[in-house]
Interface confidence: low
């Protein structure tokens, strides 16, 4: 397994609708045709997988139907969007990139993006 550099923003603030987007960029040492991107969440020293997608270079990034993530790829950049976030989901979101094919296998893990989620204030009931 060979190491690879992955860059991602340090901080992102989720929108009032609970949507956070960030770019994950990797320094590809070779001409990979198959790439796997995994988003990990680290909170209270526990790491959990948020979502993952495998894609062929030049094709769209397809997450599973049950995933809260969507994304697009452009060259060595992956634009990730995480939806449905609430305040309790605030944490460090780490981008992990694997160059699956052809060999050799490369693995890169970013330093993480701290996503802050603030639950919107409830709107007062309206008479009209």
């Amino acid at each position: 397994c060979k190491a690879m550099h992955v860059a991602q923003p340090a901080v992102v603030l989720a929108s009032s609708r609970g949507i956070a987007s960030f770019v994950c960029e990797y320094a590809s040492p070779g001409k990979a045709t198959e790439v796997r991107v995994t988003v990990l969440r680290q909170a209270d020293s526990q790491v959990t997988e948020v979502c993952a997608a495998t894609y062929m270079m030049g094709n769209e990034l397809t997450f599973l139907d049950d995933s809260i993530c969507t994304g697009t790829s452009s060259g060595n950049q992956v634009n990730l969007t995480i939806q449905g976030l609430r305040a309790m989901d605030t944490g460090l979101y780490i981008c992990k990139v694997e160059l699956m094919y052809p060999p050799p296998y490369y693995l890169g893990i970013g330093n993480g993006t701290q996503i802050y989620v603030i639950d919107p204030e409830p709107c007062p009931d309206s008479d009209f």
Epitope: T48, E49, N59, S67
Partner: antibody, heavy 120, light 106 residues
Framework: QVQLVQSGAELKKPGASVKVSCKAS????????MDWVRQAPGQGLEWIGN????????SYNQKFKGRVTITVDKSTSTAYMELRSLRSDDTAVYYC?????????????WGQGTLVTVSS | EIVLTQSPATLSLSPGERATMSCSAS?????MHWFQQKPGKAPKLLIY???ILASGVPARFSGSGSGTDYTLTISRLEPEDFATYYC?????????FGQGTKLEIK
């Protein structure tokens, strides 16, 4: 109505390859992923991998990595699953099954299955 | 890989009785999907997204659960319900199925 029709049973020797076809009809072929699942005799279900017929991007179960290739022929709305370096424990019924999307049911449609027997 | 463990492996009941089977995931999943399979036949989608009945599935079937623990319930068994039931997760690759619960006539 949606139909997935698979190719017939195959008898193969260890080390050989098999290519199973799955012809789809009754829907727009490129709108849904096609998955492949297998079931060894008396055993449970095991996911092999899938393909997006539009982009032809694939995802495979790492267990089969390097031995399996899933392809499509968009002109005939047919998906193919090729498994190489066959072993006796690859003896199973192989199913193609149509994926869904966020607003649809997943794996609601299945082919009739193709029995692949690996024996010397 | 998310491992799904179904229990019990075999459930022996009589028609008219209530059947409850479980599916436990090794890590949290978003939804659970359930399939019914009869000998020599392809699996049939029963419930998707934890609790949504697939087209044509009778209302005696229901699904529930969240996180790592999910349940399939058949409120009143009919003779045609005796089959093997599989749970499946689509939260992360590889997609995985449980080993199955065989529902047999007592």
């Amino acid at each position: 109505q949606v139909q997935l029709v698979q190719s017939g049973a195959e008898l193969k020797k260890p080390g050989a390859s098999v290519k199973v076809s799955c012809k789809a009809s009754g829907y727009t072929f490129t709108d849904y992923n096609m998955d492949w699942v297998r079931q060894a005799p008396g055993q449970g279900l095991e996911w092999i991998g899938n393909i997006n017929p539009n982009s032809e991007s694939t995802s495979y179960n790492q267990k089969f990595k390097g031995r399996v290739t899933i392809t499509v022929d968009k002109s005939t709305s047919t998906a193919y699953m090729e498994l190489r370096s066959l072993r006796s424990d690859d003896t199973a019924v192989y199913y193609c099954t149509r994926d869904g999307n966020r607003y649809d049911a997943w794996f609601a449609y299945w082919g009739q299955g193709t029995l692949v027997t690996v024996s010397s | 890989e998310i491992v799904l463990t179904q229990s019990p492996a075999t459930l022996s009941l009589s028609p008219g009785e209530r059947a409850t089977m479980s599916c436990s995931a090794s890590s949290s999943v978003t939804y659970m999907h359930w399939f019914q399979q009869k000998p020599g036949k392809a699996p049939k989608l029963l419930i998707y997204s934890t609790s949504i009945l697939a087209s044509g599935v009778p209302a005696r079937f229901s699904g529930s659960g969240s996180g790592t623990d999910y349940t399939l319930t058949i409120s009143r068994l009919e003779p045609e319900d005796f089959a093997t039931y599989y749970c499946q997760q689509r939260t992360s690759y590889p997609l995985t199925f449980g080993q199955g619960t065989k529902l047999e006539i007592k």
